[in-house]
Structure formats: structure tokens, C-alpha cells
């Protein structure tokens, strides 16, 4: 099988740029989703965000986030998600396990799922950026 070593030194500043881009795109997605009136956030859905037992940027649950956003893309044709997925793939290791998402079938519940996950994704990217910048500050002190 394919075991060639890959030499790749990625400065933390570059990772930060990816997360900044994701943060900006998450706000665009949320703004788009919030245009749908009369939809309430649900307590039934939780987007995995940061793992406490890993260092930034590997503490971001990128594979799971990708799976949730891919589900939204299938439920509602939001083209910004394509770009979000491309940037998440910069953080996802090529052998990361797949995440299965149970998709709501009811139309209104689908809308609640989309709003809830979009909101959590936006909050998650804010947290991820904070964890990156605080990690960088700790590394320099």
C-alpha cells in the first residue's frame, strides 16, 4: 500500500488563515439561513466542535463538522457550503473516520436542523479561532 512519507511544515499562521476564512464563511451561511422566518433553534441537534484532549488545530472536530455541513448541503442548496467543505478539508487528515448523520425527514424539522447546525457552526468557528490565537500566545510566552 501507499506509505510514502509526506514532509509538510505548515505554520500555525496558515492554519489560522484557514479558520479565519471558515469563520467568515460560517457567518455568511448563518445570515443566509436566518432569512427563513419562523424557524426556531432545536435542542435535538449538537454539532461536535472542539475536542479537549487535543492541541489546536487538531482539536477541531473537522470531519464531523464536514459531515453535518454536507448534510445541510443535501437538504438545502447553499453553495457557500462547497467552499466551507474545501477549507475544512485542509484541516482533515486523509484517514479520518467517516461520521454518520441521521437526517430529519420532516420539512419543518429539516429547517430547524439547518438553522441549529449553522448557528452552532458559526459559534464553533469563533471558539476555534480563540483557541488558536490563545494557543499561539501561550507558545510565545
Amino acid at each position: 500500500s501507499h506509505t510514502l512519507p509526506v514532509r509538510l511544515l505548515r505554520p500555525s499562521d496558515d492554519v489560522q488563515k484557514i479558520v479565519e476564512e471558515l469563520q467568515s464563511l460560517s457567518k455568511m451561511l448563518l445570515k443566509d439561513v436566518e432569512e427563513e422566518k419562523g424557524v426556531l433553534v432545536s435542542q435535538n441537534y449538537t454539532l461536535p466542535c472542539l475536542s479537549p484532549d487535543a492541541q489546536p488545530p487538531n482539536n477541531i472536530h473537522s470531519p464531523a463538522i464536514r459531515a453535518y455541513l454536507k448534510t445541510i448541503r443535501q437538504l438545502d442548496n447553499k453553495s457557500v457550503i462547497d467552499e466551507i467543505i474545501e477549507h475544512l478539508d485542509k484541516l482533515i487528515f486523509q484517514d479520518a473516520p467517516e461520521t454518520n448523520i441521521s437526517v430529519p425527514t420532516d420539512t419543518h424539522e429539516c429547517k430547524r436542523f439547518i438553522l441549529t447546525i449553522s448557528q452552532q457552526f458559526s459559534e464553533c468557528m469563533d471558539l476555534a479561532l480563540k483557541s488558536l490565537t490563545s494557543g499561539a500566545q501561550q507558545a510565545t510566552t
Epitope: H2, V6, I18, D82, E86, D89, K90, I92, Q94, A96
Partner: antibody, heavy 122, light 107 residues
């Protein structure tokens, strides 16, 4: 070692379609983007599109949107690029390319197919 | 789409010369850039990825660097076997466009 083997040369009539295959072997990764690139005689490299075979997710160049379809068969590790409504300007060598690297997103395309020459002529 | 402007389109230099080729991105691509070498009638070969990391088996005379949105491929001492066309390609977001290419010849 990753190997990409493409289908053989094709001669097509204007208005018809062509489907080029690219069979990959020698890798274990599941998360990756494979790209398709073409090169007209004496011209530069032109990006056509990409596929994420694990999910069949695709991205296309605006120039080819509506005319190109990229698919993948996970069971045979084969990607396909179909170009429709062919015209003489589509005469080119078509390449598939595959990345190395620790992440799902590519940094560069380390492995290339041998190229498939497509000639469009009446 | 992000545009990649490559210069010069062609150059002629003597064996042993230092050669530089530049690609300018129309927006910040944060090192997501690769350089390829293509010899006449051959398949493109990856030289540099992630702006400055050498691909396996690439001679040390090839190197990549970055200044802002300008990315440079340098051949420190041109060899006869380096006669080829060189292309850059970005991977920041699709479409992953290529530069127009630089044809390198020996004087």
C-alpha cells in the same frame, strides 16, 4: 507507489461525447480530491474539475459547466470524465491527477495519469 | 475565480545561470501553491508543493518561496535537463487555476 492508468486515445465527431477513465491503484487513503486537467496542442494546462470520490462530490470550472461530468466508482477505484457537445477546440490531451499529503485537501498533484488524447474532427 | 499571472512567458538562459519564475495570485492563497515541470511530450511532474516544500526526488537546485501574493520558483543553477515549461497552480479554493506557463530554454 500510486499509479493512475487512463483509457486509450479517442477520435470523436463534433457534437458527440467522450468519456475518459482513470484507474487508481497503490494507495490506501479514502479522503482526497482528484482533478482533471487538459492541454490543447501547444497550449498550457487548463483545470477542468475535481471529484471527492468518497462522496461523489464534484467541482467544475465555469468554462466547462454543463458540458463536463466527473464521476467515480469507489468499488473499482476508477474516476471518469465525460465531455459532451464536443467541438474541434476540445482536441487535447486529458489528464487525471492525484495528491499525496496528510490532509484531505490537496497541496499539489503528485501523481498524474499518462494522458488520453482526444481528437475532435469531422 | 483566483487568477494566477505567471511571468515571464518564456526565457532563455545559459547553463549554470540562476533562473526565477514568478506567479502572482489575484488574492491571498496562503501558500497553497504548487509548481510543475513539463518536458515536451511528457506528463507534468510536481516539483514544489505548499509553496516551498520539495517533492520527493526533486533536485535541490529547485526551490520555492513566497512574498505576499507573489510566489517564485528558483532554479539555482540551470542544467540542460531543465529545458521544459513550468506551471504554477493554486489550491486555495476551486477552481484550482494554473498560471499560463513559462518556457525555459538554454542559450
Amino acid at each position: 507507489q500510486v499509479q493512475l492508468v487512463q483509457s486509450g486515445a479517442e477520435v470523436k465527431k463534433p457534437g458527440s461525447s467522450v468519456k475518459v477513465s482513470c484507474k487508481a491503484s497503490g494507495y490506501t487513503r479514502t479522503r482526497y480530491w482528484m482533478q482533471w486537467v487538459r492541454q490543447a496542442p501547444g497550449q498550457g494546462l487548463e483545470w477542468m474539475g475535481a471529484i471527492y470520490p468518497a462522496e461523489g462530490d464534484t467541482r467544475y470550472s465555469q468554462k466547462f459547466k454543463g458540458r463536463v461530468t466527473i464521476t467515480a466508482d469507489k468499488s473499482t477505484s476508477t474516476a471518469y470524465m465525460e465531455l459532451s457537445s464536443l467541438r474541434s477546440e476540445d482536441t487535447a490531451v486529458y489528464y487525471c491527477a492525484f495528491p499525496e499529503g496528510p490532509y484531505a485537501a490537496p497541496y499539489g498533484m503528485h501523481y498524474w495519469g499518462q494522458g488520453t488524447t482526444v481528437t475532435v474532427s469531422s | 475565480a483566483i487568477q494566477m499571472t505567471q511571468s515571464p512567458s518564456s526565457l532563455s538562459a545559459s547553463v549554470g545561470d540562476r533562473v526565477t519564475i514568478t506567479c502572482r495570485a489575484s488574492r491571498n492563497i496562503h501558500n497553497y501553491l504548487a509548481w510543475y515541470q513539463q518536458k515536451p511530450g511528457k506528463v507534468p511532474k510536481l516539483l514544489i508543493y505548499y509553496a516551498k516544500t520539495s517533492a520527493s526526488g526533486v533536485p535541490s537546485r529547485f526551490s520555492g518561496s513566497r512574498s505576499g501574493t507573489d510566489y517564485t520558483l528558483t532554479i539555482s543553477s540551470l542544467q540542460p535537463e531543465d529545458v521544459a515549461t513550468y506551471y504554477c497552480q493554486h489550491f486555495w479554493k476551486t477552481p484550482w487555476t494554473f498560471g499560463g506557463g513559462t518556457k525555459v530554454e538554454i542559450k
